[in-house]
Structure formats: C-alpha cells, structure tokens
C-alpha cells in the first residue's frame, strides 16, 4: 500500500491529489484525469485541502446555548459563533465555540479587576484593607466611612461592608 | 485535421457584453469536453472556463459569475457569454479541446475593454 | 488553488544546448502536470501530458520528469523553432486548473 504525500488521498492503491478548500471530491483520479472537483453547496464548507466526497455541514449557532453567528459560513470556512453579550466562551475549538456561560459576578468583599469579554470570564480581586465593595459590577472598591466626631463606631467596616456610625 | 476557430472579439466599453464563438471542425465535437482559457497582453495563460459533453460547466471563481459558456452540438460550436467586462479582461481568448489539459488550440479572438 | 512557480523566468542558450525547465507546485498534483510551447503570436501546443508523456507528433528531445511538487521539462538538444516561451500547467485537483508564469527560452 503506498504511502501518500501530505496533500494526496488513498484510493484503493492509488494515490490522487485532494481537492482545494471550497470543494470536495465529485471524481477521483484516474490514469489520465486528475482528481475533478466540486464547489460546496450552500450551507456546507471544507477548510482545508481534502480528499472528502461531500463537503461538511456549517455549524449553527444555538441561541439556547448563549451563541449567536459572528461570521457567516462560507464554502471554505465554517461559521464562526460568538458569545452573547454577557456571556464567555467555556468550549473552544478553534475559532468554533460550543457553549457559553454566563459571566461570573464578583461576590462581595471583590471588585472587578477585568470585565468579561466574549472569551474570557470577568476577573475579581479582593479589596485592600480599609475598603469595601457589595460586589457585582463594581469596578472600584469604596473607603470605608470615617465616622465623624460627633459620631461612634458601632461596627468596623469590613471587606464586603463599610463602616457603621452612630449619632450620639 | 482538428480545427478551432474563435470569432466575437473586438472593442468593448467597461460595463458591456461580447459574445465569444469558437466553430470546431475535424473531430466529433459532442464527444469532447471544450475550454476557454485566456492570455492577457503580455502575461501567462489563465483558465476560463470548461463545458463537459453534456453540457455541465465548470468556472474560474475569479470571474465571480460575469462569464457563461454553452455549447451547440448540431453546429459544432463552443460559446462564452461576456457580461460586465472590465478592463482586466481585455486578453486574446482561445477556445481549446479538453476539460483539464488541452490538446487542441484555435489561434484566439482578441477582446479589449477600453473607454 | 494550486500556484505553479516556474524558473527560471529566461534562459539563455544556444542551438544543440541542453535545455532544463522547473515547474513547482504549492502542493502535490501527483502526476497530472502538462508543458505546453507557445511561440509569439501563435496558440500555445501541447508537449507533455502527466508529466512525462509526449503528445502526438512532439519530437523525443522533449522530455519531461518529477511527481508530487517538482517536475522538470528537458529539451536535450535545442533546435532553432524550440526557442520559445513554455508554460506547465496542473490538472491534479480541479477546477480551477492553474498555469506557471512561463519560462522563455531565448538565443544566447
């Protein structure tokens, strides 16, 4: 059995050359004619040069999952899906996402160091002594209160709350 | 003797249309499977487009659908249909036998898309 | 598609000279690789076919060789109607079937 060069197919004990991206085999080839190719339908794509009988199906980007298309299927390229706004991708297979989540909410006692994008989760960071923040969407953790002197400290504040003062 | 000969060729305005024939004579012209391919002034062959017997059609993607070719086997006669021509189609365009290599030339027709 | 890079882009030789064209292909055609001669202001003419086989009527100082990527067209002696521009051409995987540049093979 003979071993194929890198862009060439096996067929029975021949070796033909494969088709371009775009097209898939419609004839192998023979002693006198090459490999005779076919464009893509519609709604199907090859990316790479193949030896493939029928193009492969494009992806479909599913709503319920958090995709929406970000780039339309063309015959030599599957679609490309996105996250929806808000949401990141979990599983990447090369430029193709397959599901998303929804981006994590900084719990409280946490700021947001880097807003989520479409691929990556939102970042948190803990807040520094003597700041607080309720978490969320907060980008900055907030100082605690200075209780005034016509004020007590009833509770020091903490990471996740500020400061409670009474009035005397 | 195998005998292609295109005709059709001639000054178009950007935008127009010409119609390419090419009259075979010498062979069974139903039997073989016909090309176009062309050759723009001073530059290498270009593929244009092949017709297989029964009439199914393969295109130069380049060409982005602009061209179509046909064939009339009661008259022995390979046509290319020409719409929207620019001027990077002004070539010498020869009709030639086979689908994949090409065993018989006609001398050409030259085309030039000028205004 | 495929892109044929031929070289050189001239050689310069004289009559009786041994003549070596190279065709090479961005990825294989196999076997499927033909050579046509085209003198000014004429069609081009078929020589070789899958890559090493003459057509009717070319002369046996044509000669062409290689697989895959690399083929080589040898013109072993060269007669005065053999100075001309050449041209190979893939038909492995198609359409489109694509042509090199040319090489022009001019008197020294």
């Known amino acids: 059995q003979p071993s194929c060069r890198q862009e060439e197919f096996l067929v029975g004990d021949e070796c033909c050359p494969m088709c371009n991206p775009g097209y898939h085999v419609k004839q192998v080839c023979s002693e006198h004619t090459g490999t005779v190719c076919a464009p893509c339908p519609p709604q199907t794509y090859t990316a790479h040069a193949n030896g493939l009988s029928k193009c492969l199906p494009c992806g479909v980007c599913d709503p319920d999952m958090g995709l929406l298309t970000w780039q339309e299927c063309s015959s030599w390229k599957d679609t490309v899906c996105r996250c929806i706004p808000g949401y990141f991708c979990e599983n990447q297979d090369g430029s193709h996402c397959s599901t998303c989540l929804q981006h994590t909410t900084c719990p409280p006692g946490q700021r947001v160091e880097k807003r989520g994008t479409h691929d990556q989760d939102t970042v948190c960071a803990d807040c520094l002594t003597g700041t607080f923040s309720l978490g969320g969407t907060q980008e900055e953790c907030l100082p605690w209160t200075n209780c005034s002197a016509f004020q007590q400290e009833v509770r020091r504040g903490t990471n996740s709350t500020d400061t409670t003062c009474s009035s005397q | 003797e195998v005998q292609l000969l295109e005709s059709g060729g001639g000054l178009v305005q950007p935008g127009g249309s010409l119609r390419l024939s090419c009259a075979a004579s010498?062979?069974?012209?139903?039997?073989?499977?016909m090309s176009w391919v062309r050759q723009a002034p001073g530059k290498g062959l270009e593929w244009v487009s092949e017709i297989s017997q029964s009439g199914s059609s393969n295109y130069n993607p380049s060409l982005k659908s602009r061209f179509t070719i046909s064939r009339d086997n009661s008259k022995n006669t390979l046509y290319l249909q020409m719409n929207s021509l620019r001027a990077e189609d002004t070539a010498v365009y020869y009709c030639?036998?086979?689908?994949?290599?090409?065993?018989?030339w006609g001398q050409g027709t030259l085309v030039t898309v000028s205004s | 598609e495929i892109v044929l890079t031929q070289s050189p882009g001239t050689l310069s030789l004289s009559p009786g000279e041994r003549a070596t064209l190279s065709c090479r292909a961005s990825?294989?055609?196999?076997?499927?690789l033909a050579w046509y001669q085209q003198k000014p202001g004429q069609a081009p003419r078929l020589l070789i076919y899958?890559?090493?086989t003459r057509a009717t009527g070319i002369p046996d100082r044509f000669s062409g060789s290689g697989s895959g990527t690399d083929f080589t067209l040898t013109i072993s002696r060269l007669e005065p109607e053999d100075f001309a521009v050449y041209y190979c051409?893939?038909?492995?995987?198609?359409?489109?079937?694509?042509f090199g540049q040319g090489t022009k093979v001019e008197i020294k």
């Open positions: 051409q893939q038909y492995g995987s198609s359409p489109p079937v694509t």
């Open positions: 030639a036998t086979g689908r994949w290599r090409f065993d018989y």
């Open positions: 899958g890559a090493s």
């Open positions: 010498g062979f069974t012209f139903s039997s073989y499977a």
């Open positions: 990825r294989s055609v196999g076997k499927y």
